[in-house]
């Protein structure tokens, strides 16, 4: 396979919908940034299709993406992060569709991690803490976090809390007693960068104490 389309292939290609979306991750591996693109139609035949980014790069004019199954991926230090780049879907030397994108407006943060919940008996509350790799970064340092929690039996009844810090207090009286809860967190750029929600952190599960009948308070576990 040369990677170049035959004439018939090119005519077929022009009938397809090659709309795509991309997200960037800055300083995802030391000082390296990444850019990930994928077709919006999962049925597109990607056999001979390549992605290329040109413009707003350091020391080079263009960069080619690596193909990883259904996604296209670049990891590099060469993003200038100033101005717009042109990202194109190509068959051989022919561009099928292109998008002008500023990579600082399509940032997807890394998922938060180390989510945990600690019950404070004296305070009758739960302290939720988590970590994010972005605290150490030069660029995308300011994030908005979305903490979502639900009673395990309530399939889709998530309660969401937005916060800018990595610590949240949940009052015991706002939760059901003797119930199992699931909690998770994700992040989005806030100030200076724009983009998308991160993946969710792994879920953490915790149980609320029983109510102590004499006082009306919950018993610790």
């Amino acid at each position: 396979e040369s990677g170049y389309a035959q004439n018939g292939d090119l005519e077929d290609a022009e009938l397809d919908d090659y709309s795509f979306s991309c997200y960037s991750q800055l300083e995802v591996n030391g000082s390296q940034h990444s850019l990930t693109c994928a077709f919006e139609d999962p049925d597109v035949n990607i056999t001979n299709l390549e992605f290329e980014i040109c413009g707003a790069l350091v020391e080079v004019k263009c960069l080619n993406f690596r193909k990883l199954q259904e996604i296209y991926f670049i990891e590099t230090k060469k993003f200038l992060l100033i101005g717009k780049s042109n990202i194109c879907v190509k068959v051989g030397e022919k561009s099928l569709t292109c998008k002008k994108i500023d990579l600082t407006t399509i940032v997807k943060p890394e998922a938060p991690f180390d989510l945990s919940v600690v019950y404070r008996e004296g305070a009758n509350d739960f302290v939720v803490t988590f970590n994010t790799s972005h605290l150490q970064k030069k660029y995308v340092k300011v994030l908005m976090h979305d903490v979502a929690y639900r009673q395990e039996k309530d399939e889709n009844k998530w309660t969401h809390v937005n916060l800018s810090s990595t610590k949240l207090t949940l009052l015991q009286r706002k939760l059901q007693p003797a119930a199992m809860y699931e909690i998770k967190v994700r992040s989005i750029p806030d100030h200076y960068f724009k983009g998308f929600w991160s993946e969710w952190s792994p879920s953490y599960y915790f149980r609320t104490p029983e109510i102590n009948n004499s006082s009306g308070e919950m018993d610790p576990i």
């Epitope: 040109c54 413009g55 707003a56 004019k61 992060l81 100033i82 101005g83 717009k84 780049s85 042109n86 002008k100 500023d102 600082t104 407006t105 660029y139 100030h191 200076y192 960068f193």
Partner: nanobody, 118 residues
Framework: EVQLVESGGGLVQAGGSLRLSCESS????????MGWFRQAAGKEREFLAA????????HYGDSVKGRFTISRDNAKNTVYLQMDSLKPEDTAVYYC???????????WGQGTQVTVSS
Amino acid sequence: EVQLVESGGGLVQAGGSLRLSCESSARTFSDDAMGWFRQAAGKEREFLAAINWSGAVTHYGDSVKGRFTISRDNAKNTVYLQMDSLKPEDTAVYYCAEDYDTDVWQHWGQGTQVTVSS
């Protein structure tokens, strides 16, 4: 048509400072990258500094790194170039540019003269 108007140039002694301003008429200013360049008599235009739409990312030419600082105020549609430790070789016409799109600056100002005397 986008208009860029530079100001703040003038005559300054070596070792002194100047702050250039560039005001843009563009409605898209807060989405656009901005840059500063200069051109000395008989020389090619030289890149000095650039800043992304939010001000979070900056990039400098080697000749001014550590001496010049680019910044912006999106509420005022203005980009600035703070120039410190000026040298006679910084004498030039200074230009601002807007909207860095696939390696081409789309809009240019008329320039402001900076003269550094020894």
